[in-house]
Interface confidence: low
Amino acid sequence: VEVQVSEDPVVALVDTDATLRCSFSPEPGFSLAQLNLIWQLTDTKQLVHSFTEGRDQGSAYSNRTALFPDLLVQGNASLRLQRVRVTDEGSYTCFVSIQDFDSAAVSLQVAAPYSKPSMTLEPNKDLRPGNMVTITCSSYQGYPEAEVFWKDGQGVPLTGNVTTSQMANERGLFDVHSVLRVVLGANGTYSCLVRNPVLQQDAHGSVTITGQPLTF
């Protein structure tokens, strides 16, 4: 028996369902009573889901997995993972045994889009050209870690005096806070771009300082 999986990682959004595709080529006369199908975590060998002794043994992993029972006899051994969490990310091995056996691993990449950044300014009043200000760009609930880029009003990248911190919250999603320290010109726009490298999703925020008032 030959097991086939997708070579590219499966990308799944947090809280959505993902299908980890796995297939084998059944011989003529194949019956499900012959099938031993095991899904396990590649690294730890923890059992995820199994089909043995002619029946679905159910989920051994978070009760969030399912097979496609009607398609098994056709050689479809794919695994459905429901309500994906950050901790589901990783490699899963599909192991198929009939008379002989084969296995293959598929990677699950979890992703979550970042929120539109919120911009804060410190100090936020009585600003004068030449003042040093701190602009903070905050974006929330993304995964994996973001790439953060700052630009001025002319689109020129600002790389100096930037400090970016990323903290995982209780769901493993990241909150990103990027701080730009800059000396004010007469007026100016400062833009922050938070990029999710897996989704290629860009979230933009900007602050424009034109004397008073400030516009965000």
């Epitope: 923890q46 978070s62 009760n63 901790t87 995982a168 919250n169 209780e170 769901r171 493993g172």
Partner: antibody, heavy 121, light 107 residues
Framework: QVQLVESGAEVKKPGSSVKVSCKAS????????ISWVRQAPGQGLEWMGR????????NYAQKFQGRVTITADKSTSTAYMELSSLRSEDTAVYYC??????????????WGQGTLITVSS | DIQMTQSPSTLSASVGDRLTITCRAS??????LAWYQQKPGKAPKLLIY???YLQTGVPSRFSGSGSGTEFTLTITSLQPDDFASYYC?????????FGGGTKVEIK
Amino acid sequence: QVQLVESGAEVKKPGSSVKVSCKASGGTFSSYAISWVRQAPGQGLEWMGRIIPILGIANYAQKFQGRVTITADKSTSTAYMELSSLRSEDTAVYYCANGGDSSSWYTFDYWGQGTLITVSS
Amino acid sequence: DIQMTQSPSTLSASVGDRLTITCRASQNINSWLAWYQQKPGKAPKLLIYKASYLQTGVPSRFSGSGSGTEFTLTITSLQPDDFASYYCQQYDSNPLTFGGGTKVEIK
């Protein structure tokens, strides 16, 4: 079936610290969150914080920030809650709780038996 | 922090009664609400999650409804085993917060 077994009751002096343990069995310890919830005598439930062992991340309620430390030892499937600078109002039953493998990190299907911490001079 | 306000704080009832306990959130929590039952000297027991989903093994006389800021727990026909305290808990945001509790006692 997840089981959570906590350490025994303790009596502590004001200003001291206490460390309560919670040993988990019957589930994949590292992949679920362990929360600590306390209940003062005759009072309601109060969430203190949680740890997600697989991520090594702890979160605390602001009220306890700086006084509570939640840790986990994956090798023994045990979570710990240490509360420092104890005062009389910390007298309570302390529970560890989690959602098990089948629920969320935010609701609690499984609870320890509770550990009574009495703070008294 | 999100404040959870339960009412009433005490409820006197008889076996067979239909009971409704209300929980109000200080801000919108969508459907991220759970209900627990607690008996004296015991740990709480999860009854309802996501406002209306019955936890496995919980009798169908318990039901939950609501979304946003207003939620209710209903017991259609009170049984002797149901005399206990009930707590709501929001899990929309950190910190997780509980309501003050409702004690259901025998009339």
